[in-house]
């Protein structure tokens, strides 16, 4: 799967390769199967959406988002406390302004709960990842894609 | 065996190519980011170039901006450094590093043994 | 970018003398400070994360300590092995990761 997403500027290089993995899933133990890539946009530093394909998994999986900031006054992990979903399956994180530290570093971690070994963690440049835009339709989000919050996430979890 | 190890290197003309090569084994490699450093003749470490997990985020040095490539193949457990318009001053060891999240905390738990580029005309 | 200055350089001691080597940021790093030993056509092998945790498997005797700017490696009985070249890399402003210039430890 190869999605192109806005190109914005700076040195870092930002198609959406998500790597899917052609091993079979019973050769490998949970714990090593690769995870999808989170893709993070700042759109007008209003919000941020930190998104990634949930249908790369072998089986649906609620997959958590946390992150940090490298920073003296606030390096506590944070979970996510909206998720996005894409058919009932977590697709992704948003933030919001509050949220949002352009020149800090921004940790992104991602983790099976089912298998906490099961994570991976990369950090980012924010600045590097600002889209300007007017208007978005439902369309350019990529169909049904909802806001939940990590309340909803726990009773839809367990539901 | 948990390891990593370079090959690729060699003598190369100033202007040349060379594309490294960076072998993983015994972690998952897919869900690690690996780094690129280097160490000059009887210099200091130097880091050249990061590459995030699944690939699509990378980050490059100033002094190789522009003339490293920095890719990885996590189907074969491979990271590769292609390496263009070489100069004198890339002479160095150059040593993959794989990194490591404790807490909020990220170091180079794993590195390779190196393998050795030289520039010279 | 950041920059990373040890202190000494160079330093000669003895088996068994307590031995500390500095580093210093051009800014303030919080506790993301790791150390690394480099044996001459080695490679590096990480000694300390987050400026005062012992890497699993290493010696008791290897600590580390500061946050903000300034920061300590101390060896508190110098064994025959632990001579080597030391660095200490900040991983804050990250990347770029920078490294101290190193501090060659040599036996007196």
């Known amino acids: 799967l190869n999605t192109t997403i806005l190109t914005p500027n700076g040195n870092e290089d930002t198609t959406a390769d998500f790597f899917l993995t052609t091993m079979p899933t019973d050769s490998l133990s949970v714990s090593t199967l690769p995870l999808p890539e989170v893709q993070c946009f700042v759109f007008n530093v209003e919000y941020m959406n930190c998104t990634w394909n949930s249908s790369s998994e072998p089986q649906p999986t609620n997959l958590t988002l946390h992150y940090w900031y490298k920073n003296s006054d606030n390096d506590k992990v944070q979970k996510c406390s909206h998720y996005l979903f894409s058919e009932e399956i977590t697709s992704g994180c948003q933030l919001q302004k509050k949220e949002i530290h352009l020149y800090q570093t921004f940790v992104v971690q991602l983790q099976d709960p089912r298998e906490p070994r099961r994570q991976a963690t990369q950090m980012l440049k924010l600045q590097n990842l600002v889209i300007e835009q007017k208007l978005i339709s439902e369309e350019d989000l990529g169909g049904e894609q909802k806001l939940i919050s990590e309340e909803d996430l726990h009773h839809h979890h367990h539901h | 065996q948990v390891q990593l190890v370079e090959s690729g290197g060699g003598v190369v003309k100033p202007g040349g190519s060379l594309r490294l090569s960076c072998a993983a084994s015994?972690?998952?490699?897919?869900?690690?980011?690996i780094h690129w450093v280097r160490q000059a003749p009887g210099k200091g470490l130097e880091w050249v170039a990061l590459?995030?997990?699944?690939?699509?985020?990378?980050y490059y040095a100033d002094s190789v901006k522009g003339r490293f490539t920095i890719s990885r193949d996590n189907s074969k457990n491979t990271l590769s450094l292609q390496m263009n318009s070489l100069r004198a001053e890339d002479t160095a060891v150059y040593y993959c590093a794989k990194e490591v999240w404790t807490g909020t905390y990220d170091s180079f738990d794993m590195w390779g043994r190196g393998t050795m580029v030289t520039v010279s005309s | 970018d950041i920059q990373m200055t040890q202190s000494p350089s160079s330093l000669s001691a003895s088996v068994g003398d307590r031995v500390t080597i500095t580093c210093r940021a051009s800014q303030s790093i919080s506790s993301y400070l790791n150390w690394y030993q480099q044996k001459p056509g080695k490679a590096p092998k990480l000694l300390i994360y987050?400026?005062?945790s012992l890497q699993s498997g290493v010696p008791s005797r290897f600590s580390g300590s500061g946050s903000g700017t300034d920061f300590t490696l101390t060896i508190s009985s110098l064994q025959p092995e632990d001579f080597a070249t030391y660095y200490c890399q900040q991983s804050y402003s990250t990347p770029p990761i920078t490294f101290g210039q190193g501090t060659r430890l040599e036996i007196k």
């Open positions: 590459i995030s997990y699944a690939g699509s985020n990378k």
């Open positions: 987050a400026a005062s």
């Open positions: 015994g972690f998952t490699f897919s869900n690690s980011g």
